[in-house]
């Protein structure tokens, strides 16, 4: 005979546990429904009756099964160094993305904290190593031979043209200039452009309870300009 | 571009009953709510209530609980405001108003208005 | 209910005066949900600030607010013809969502 089924709430078997979006109700000593995820329980079950689930209200979210007095207070709008890749809804938090150009300089347990913007380096110097979406930009002075006239988050040393005649010779910061005969190149010609790095990450703020019980607001701090580096610039 | 259009002025006999509608184009109504304002001659705002046209669910100020019956009817992109047992003091300028889900209550949109005088 | 409570109720001043209201609760709100409106009279009012400090877009960055907790204000740095209404703060981190009384800024 197939085993008969229990509806919620019932006592489970002696050592046994609740099922799937169950939970054990310590107070009622009874396997109780869970709420979905947008909702949450407002009124917990008894002996003789289940869990009442209403809807998230409005900035608030669930994204798991659960049964949670409030729901979870969205993180604070994007700021203006930001995107929003995901809309605060009764499932799910905000997200919010470094935009291009800049990266996460101050990370936490669940995304980012605050974005600055990625440092350029200046003529005379070259990206060393490429901006991600949590690290910032490493500058190089330019070795001999090679050189770099822009102030660029992406542009690497190029070399500098080989004339059969040299007119002005190349530093760090400047081409070489040939007289009227063709110049070439020890290497291929044209900058190089490293691609920006896309931001993917994570950075919704920290969940924290809704405000009819304690409203913890989490906020991104200001964002100021990146530090100084050697070959870098603020701009 | 977003609109919210109301109907227009009405004049009531006290002990009567009005219907104001709010008509929303240029934005999808499944994630916001609509709210109620209003606002009587020379008085500042006063929340009455909103509606989420999604769900049909409504929450009230209680001092309108008894008062103000709020409804939508999604397939015209409608909100309604129905007062039933006008006094002379719900004559105000009853206010739509939408605030999007998840930007925690700021009414970034409003109607234009409906005058309703109560007058015997 | 949260009391919202404004001062001045009303103000006179020139153009070009910087011009501060501030907004008391009776209790404690969270920052993401104190906004401030203006309203012409006549007109329905208009989303000035959201969320404490942020400006939607085409509102003039003359106007700044700031605060927390229980006391929140609306600044105006320099005052132009068109700024001459009523400013209101409303809450909506509990239920009743209220406004403060307004604020009617007046020319000198």
């Known amino acids: 005979l197939p085993a008969q089924v229990a509806f919620t709430p019932y006592a489970p078997e002696p050592g046994g546990t609740c099922r799937l979006r169950e939970y054990y109700d310590q107070t009622a000593q009874m396997c109780c429904s869970k709420c979905p995820p947008g909702q949450h329980a407002k009124v917990f079950c008894t002996k003789t009756s289940d869990t009442v689930c209403d809807s998230c209200e409005d900035s608030t979210y669930t994204q798991l099964w659960n049964w949670v007095p409030e729901c979870l207070s969205c993180g604070s709008r994007c700021s203006s160094d930001q995107v929003e890749t995901q809309a605060c809804t009764r499932e799910q938090n905000r997200i919010c993305t470094c935009r291009p150009g800049w990266y996460c300089a101050l990370s936490k347990q669940e995304g980012c904290r605050l974005c600055a913007q990625l440092r350029k380096c200046r003529p005379g110097f070259g990206v060393a190593r490429p901006g991600t979406e949590t690290s910032d930009v490493v500058c190089k002075p330019c070795a001999p031979g090679t050189f770099s006239n822009t102030t660029s988050s992406t542009d690497i040393c190029r070399p500098h043209q080989i004339c059969h005649v040299v007119a002005i010779p190349g530093n760090a910061s400047m081409d070489a200039v040939c007289t009227s005969t063709s110049p070439t190149r020890s290497m291929a010609p044209g900058a190089v452009h490293l691609p920006q790095p896309v931001s993917t990450r994570s950075q919704h703020t920290q969940p924290t309870p809704a405000p009819s019980t304690a409203p913890g607001t989490s906020f991104l701090l200001p964002v100021g300009p990146s530090p100084p580096a050697e070959g870098s610039t603020g701009d | 571009q977003v609109q919210l259009v109301q109907s227009g002025s009405e004049l009531k006999k006290p002990g009567a009953s009005v219907k104001v509608s709010c008509k929303a184009s240029g934005f999808n109504n499944k994630d916001i709510y609509m709210h109620w304002v209003r606002q009587a001659p020379g008085q500042g705002l006063e929340w009455m209530g909103r509606?989420?046209?999604?769900?049909?669910?409504?929450k009230h100020d209680p001092k309108f609980q008894d008062k103000a019956v709020l409804s939508s009817d999604t397939s015209v992109s409608t909100a309604y405001l129905q007062i039933s047992s006008l006094k002379a003091e719900d004559t105000a300028v009853y206010y739509c108003?939408?605030?999007?889900?998840?930007?925690?209550?700021?009414?970034?949109?409003w109607g234009q208005g409906t005058l309703v005088t109560v007058s015997s | 209910d949260i009391q919202m409570t404004q001062s001045p109720s009303s103000l006179s001043a020139s153009v070009g005066d910087r011009v501060t209201i501030t907004c008391t609760a009776s209790s404690s709100v969270s920052s993401n949900y104190l906004h401030w409106y203006q309203q012409k009279p006549g007109k329905a009012p208009k989303l000035l600030i959201y969320?404490?400090?942020n400006l939607p877009s085409g509102v003039p960055s003359r106007f700044s607010g700031s605060g927390s907790g229980t006391d929140f204000t609306l600044t105006i740095s320099s005052l132009q013809p068109e700024d001459f209404a009523t400013y209101y703060c409303?809450?909506?981190?509990?239920?009743?969502?209220?406004f403060g009384q307004g604020t009617k800024v007046e020319i000198k």
């Open positions: 509606i989420d046209p999604a769900t049909g669910n409504t």
């Open positions: 969320s404490t400090s």
């Open positions: 108003a939408r605030s999007p889900y998840g930007d925690f209550g700021a009414m970034d949109y």
């Open positions: 409303h809450q909506y981190h509990r239920s009743p969502w209220t």
